[in-house]
């Protein structure tokens, strides 16, 4: 959106679907006139949940959002809701900028860096352009993770950014792996964090007019090894009609690399269990967590034979976890009948150790999953 004198969406027509969500950068002192809907039938404008009055410096009137002279406190989220239906017609975020160029998704100019094609604007102290990206002040992350701190800012002249750790200049020279500074992104990135990275990180943004700073707190959590955690309730009991497709989901959380197997409990010679008391199972799918789709078991065109108990089994270097669910398959001709499948069993009773693979787990624990 280019604007030489004011930010304006014209004519005052209902926005296209592509217009519904926009982010506009507005220069301080710049008038704003945004339209939503048709004149008398225009929508109501709200800022941060409060409806704008039809009079005043910032007003919502006949479908228009009008700001006489844009101030820093005018930045924020603006919604235009259709009269009566409360349908969102416009979803705008106004951001304080330092040039008379309003940015949209196609162009995100930072032309204030090149004053040759600019008018002369008054100097301005630094200010945060995207404070919503700075809301997370405390970063508590596991050791080995990547951490990113951001302090997007602007000002005139364009400010510089530098970083402090615990009040001291921080360039990362003493940090294994160093740091990554992207000045155009106003960001500091540290990969593979370790406990010695804990501390207070300060971004200091300054220009000739003034300076601003913001503190982030980093806590590095030392990993406590544990066997995989399976999200409760997954896989879930499922009822399907013959011929339909079924997806069983298993969400696995594990610091150590987990291996996952999907098992179907089967009956051999009329029995579900072997003489040793362990169940007969068929391995349907096996892979590690990084494999595509491993946490989802797809059953295509199910038949009555697919009904039964399914188990998601996950193991890592620490141990093993597994949970089961039942699939009930209904005949095609009677889709209204519903069977009460047994409760999903959280079969997580045993502690296991792990040697080198799931089969070794079973061997080591004498768990003979008969196939």
């Amino acid at each position: 959106l280019e604007a030489s004198e004011e930010v304006e969406l014209e004519p005052c027509l209902a926005p296209s679907l592509e217009q519904q969500e926009q982010e506009l950068t507005v220069a301080l002192g710049q008038p704003v006139r945004l339209c939503c809907g048709r004149a008398e039938r225009g929508g109501h404008w709200y800022k941060e949940g409060s409806r704008l009055a039809p009079a005043g410096r910032v007003r919502g009137w006949r479908g228009r959002l009008e700001i006489a002279s844009f101030l820093p406190e005018d930045a924020g989220r603006y919604l235009c809701l259709a009269r009566g239906s409360m349908i969102v017609l416009q979803n705008l975020t106004l951001i304080t900028g330092d040039s008379l160029t309003s940015s949209n998704d196609d162009e995100d100019p930072k032309s204030h860096r090149d004053p040759s094609n600019r008018h002369s604007y008054p100097q301005q102290a630094p200010y945060w352009t995207h404070p919503q990206r700075m809301e997370k002040k405390l970063h508590a992350v596991p050791a080995g993770n990547t951490v990113k701190f951001r302090c997007p800012a602007a000002g005139n002249p364009t400010p510089t950014i530098r970083w402090l750790k615990d009040g001291q200049a921080f360039h990362g020279e003493n940090r294994i792996g160093g740091i990554r500074l992207r000045h155009q992104h106003w960001s500091l990135v540290m990969e593979s964090v370790v406990p010695s990275d804990r501390g207070t990180y300060t971004c200091l943004v300054e220009n000739a007019v003034g300076s601003i700073r913001y503190n982030y707190l980093l806590d590095v959590l030392e990993r406590s090894p544990h066997r995989p955690i399976l999200q409760a309730g997954l896989p879930a009991n499922t009822t399907a009609v013959v011929g339909s497709d079924v997806e069983l989901l298993c969400k696995v959380y594990s610091d150590a690399q987990p291996h996952i197997q999907w098992l179907k409990h089967i009956v051999i010679n009329g029995s579900s269990f072997g003489a040793d008391g362990f169940p007969y199972v068929q391995v349907l799918k096996t892979a590690d967590i990084n494999s595509s789709e491993v946490e989802v078991l797809y059953l295509r065109n199910v038949s009555a034979e697919d009904a039964g108990e399914y188990t998601c089994l996950a193991g890592n270097s620490i141990g093993l976890s597994y949970q089961s669910a039942w699939l009930t398959v209904l005949p095609e001709e009677d889709p209204t009948w519903t069977a009460a499948a047994p409760e999903a069993r959280y079969t997580d009773k045993l502690e296991f150790r792990h040697d080198s693979g799931l089969n070794d787990i079973f061997e080591a624990q004498k768990i003979e999953w008969h196939e």
Epitope: S103, D105, D106, E107, D108, P109, K110, S111, R113, D114, H130, R133, K136, V141, P142, N145, T146, K148, P152, R180, L181, R182, H183, Q184, H185, V189, E191
Partner: antibody
Framework: EVQLLESGGGLVQPGGSLRLSCAAS????????MSWVRQAPGKGLEWVSV????????HYADSVRGRFTISRDNSKNTLYLQMNSLRAEDTAVYYC????????????WGQGTLVTVSS | DIQMTQSPSSLSASVGDRVTITCRAS??????LNWYQQKPGKAPKLLIY???NLQSGVPSRFSGSGSGTDFTLTISSLQPEDFATYYC?????????FGQGTKVEIK
Amino acid sequence: EVQLLESGGGLVQPGGSLRLSCAASGFTFSDYAMSWVRQAPGKGLEWVSVIEGDASYTHYADSVRGRFTISRDNSKNTLYLQMNSLRAEDTAVYYCARERTYSSAFDYWGQGTLVTVSS
Amino acid sequence: DIQMTQSPSSLSASVGDRVTITCRASQDISSDLNWYQQKPGKAPKLLIYDASNLQSGVPSRFSGSGSGTDFTLTISSLQPEDFATYYCQQHYSPSHTFGQGTKVEIK
């Protein structure tokens, strides 16, 4: 209109070198970070390298670090990728892409240039 | 590096269907996730940036959600031109890794 046009691809032997170029137009080139992204035949997208608008920052994927060098000439509105010690696994279509400010999303892409590494 | 895992790797759907593709990061990446669409022989096209923001010119039937490690791309009503491969990409770490892709095919 934003346009990105890659060139310089072709057939090269393992161990050889190639220099790709990406000519940009329709926007203030120096205001934007630029990246190279590649796609091996029948495979997915792999990010290769990025360079900040003022060339103050570069970064590389582990698979190419030490062999590839990204650079730019803002006076010519051109992005480059110097590829040395090429391997068969570097065979791919190479795209240059513009980074959307702040979000590091690639909002404009070139049409790609094919690099084939084979003896 | 941060790994991105997409699921499913392929799916079959019909015009008008609601389609959901998921992407999981190996660690918290805040909302630093983008979605792209790619058709055979063409360059990718940006659909969603920063997890939930619709790129200019992209139809509103596309939407993105999620933060942290789990993200979703939803096509509310699949259109003929939407049959393509979709990729997620994280930009939290310096190496902007992509997911392996999800191919959406006609049923």
